[in-house]
Amino acid sequence: KSSNEATNITPKHNMKAFLDELKAENIKKFLYNFTQIPHLAGTEQNFQLAKQIQSQWKEFGLDSVELAHYDVLLSYPNKTHPNYISIINEDGNEIFNTSLFEPPPPGYENVSDIVPPFSAFSPQGMPEGDLVYVNYARTEDFFKLERDMKINCSGKIVIARYGKVFRGNKVKNAQLAGAKGVILYSDPADYFAPGVKSYPDGWNLPGGGVQRGNILNLNGAGDPLTPGYPANEYAYRRGIAEAVGLPSIPVHPIGYYDAQKLLEKMGGSAPPDSSWRGSLKVPYNVGPGFTGNFSTQKVKMHIHSTNEVTRIYNVIGTLRGAVEPDRYVILGGHRDSWVFGGIDPQSGAAVVHEIVRSFGTLKKEGWRPRRTILFASWDAEEFGLLGSTEWAEENSRLLQERGVAYINADSSIEGNYTLRVDCTPLMYSLVHNLTKELKSPDEGFEGKSLYESWTKKSPSPEFSGMPRISKLGSGNDFEVFFQRLGIASGRARYTKNWETNKFSGYPLYHSVYETYELVEKFYDPMFKYHLTVAQVRGGMVFELANSIVLPFDCRDYAVVLRKYADKIYSISMKHPQEMKTYSVSFDSLFSAVKNFTEIASKFSERLQDFDKSNPIVLRMMNDQLMFLERAFIDPLGLPDRPFYRHVIYAPSSHNKYAGESFPGIYDALFDIESKVDPSKAWGEVKRQIYVAAFTVQAAAETLSEVA
């Protein structure tokens, strides 16, 4: 069967029919429905929402919709023993306490089960000691403190501002520096955009607002007690002491009103430079400890949260493919939220809901996609990508053989300025071609394409006339599919103007103020940006599931491989003497990249010319495209990170949110000048070059003619 026989709608009309069926008003309605009460992972409310989504997806017309449950480690505050931080005097009396909860937003005062701000998976403890301010708690911040300023964090409680990097990396860095507790806070410099009012009068963070979030360092493991395997009914669970990624010191988040009280008394060293100063009216002294008059006062943390094995529920919907039912295109986003989830995740879940409804409408009219589409509503993303990872672990054999692509669908918006896309290079051309066919929602771009407004507002740093597309990092549910399984992945959302807004994420991220009203009043009153994101995500899924030849261009991988090889070579060349001494050569890598480029070019030529009416040859060529991403997987994984197996991309070891290219080589080179055994260190660099070169060459050969 050709894919045309799978439908009674003409092929050109297919995509248009799908896109035309998507309605902004429906997305708005779904968002409202999903945000009226909290949907914290592991709670009854989130289970009920899972069942509601299951029921509605069935009504929309999917072939089957099932719940997939797992019993995973989650973390909750103690309801009767709240977490807080105190300033104590020399007698041990608490003279100041941080707030126990955020002031609820207007209209939500009587909502029950709003979880107070906490750092998920913090151990219990009541450490007390002097405070040290560590800026963003990045690797370079601790280098500055320890190496340049000679400040020792051992036995201290550190206070770090949120932003720049994933909070779990901050905690890991603090632990390695010997800290005995971590206080995380939102500084107005990062979470209060100038000229905008704080919620409920605008989209800025009020002083009592606090960012929740997990502080794990899972490195792709999923449930901390069952790494590598699903947390099912017969799972063998590790003891808590052997659990993956748990922090070893107490951690707690606060807002900037409370942070002001802690930071205004700081003494010790002055901040090293202006990059360590935020926007509070405090000196931003580093410490340790409080200034003269207050030097006998200490900070004490009171953390009583508990880790509990709890049941979570994914919703998995299937729309069976008419021609290649054993090829899966997956659209997934999470359902669990910290509180109301006005942006994260429900702005994404509402878009997924409308995409399912549109696909269902076409199916009811007799249409089917060529390939199977799987839709997923993931649970416990906020607790470490647990729902998606457990499901992928359970279904890994199917996914590695049948997985064509994964499109992520968390928050649809983090601003309303322009499009933001992170994806595998295989999807660059798909994204370019699709956005050229979509209308821009932006003011001043009426009648212009999305591609045009996106390119104008977010130009590629390398190629003129093209938009910026970023590397995939982590911190979301695509991680297991891309970094562990090597399934081509992508994500798209509307974002802010990074040029003028230097704050991290959006100000109300993971706070109680992330409500429906935040979106409806301040971000997207017409839901036109949500609709555009639905068109991009849905359009990508449609093309991936329905095009006869998979819309992947392997030549774009060749281009970035050369760019990444150049970049890592230039990093290494900062040490020319050592490269000479230890005979470090990148020739094998550049040779492999050259071979990849030539083979990809020839493959693309064959792709233009082959007989698409021959189903065997078509399937063969498509399989070569599908398995190309898989070919970049090293079964042994990266050093000390066995679940990060992609040799070209991994989450940065210093910031989970960011993607790093040739991560094995990059990590081997990082801070190499400080290594105690240079010979061993440069030996590891050489080994990583070897692994990378071999992998690129092996991947290239999967594109060669099969015989």
Partner: nanobody, 123 residues
Framework: QVQLVESGGGVVQPGRSLRLSCVAS????????MHWVRQAPGKGREWVAV????????YYADSVKGRFTISRDNSKNTLYLQMNSLRPEDTAVYYC????????????????WGQGTTVTVSS
């Protein structure tokens, strides 16, 4: 409409106790710091105590420290002032007052006042 209604005042002998209440309506009580302020006959207003919106912090004027306790029940939209070891100089009209900005504590930034309740300490 927005209002604060105090009650619990009365005449009491020195050394005895009294508990004042203030019921709030028309605004989200749970989101605002609350104060007690008093005005003795023929004198200006004197700040007595403040409690944060969530009850995590309470501060007192030196003149009442150790004798008065401010508390709140957010589920009942009610503010309390427990006054022990009363003295003649505690005689005053006691007002509750609401912070103007939600989630913050200030010494004197109030936007709503009650009508007051009179406390007389006399033997």
């Amino acid at each position: 409409q927005v209002q604060l209604v105090e009650s619990g005042g009365g005449v009491v002998q020195p050394g005895r106790s009294l508990r004042l209440s203030c019921v709030a309506s028309g605004f989200p009580f749970i989101s605002y710091g609350m104060h007690w302020v008093r005005q003795a006959p023929g004198k200006g207003r004197e700040w007595v105590a403040v409690i944060s919106y969530d009850g995590s912090n309470r501060y007192y004027a030196d003149s009442v420290k150790g004798r008065f306790t401010i508390s709140r029940d957010n589920s009942k939209n009610t503010l309390y002032l427990q006054m022990n070891s009363l003295r003649p100089e505690d005689t005053a009209v006691y007002y509750c007052a609401k912070e103007r900005i939600f989630g913050v504590l200030t010494p004197d930034d109030f936007d709503i006042w009650g009508q007051g309740t009179t406390v007389t300490v006399s033997s």
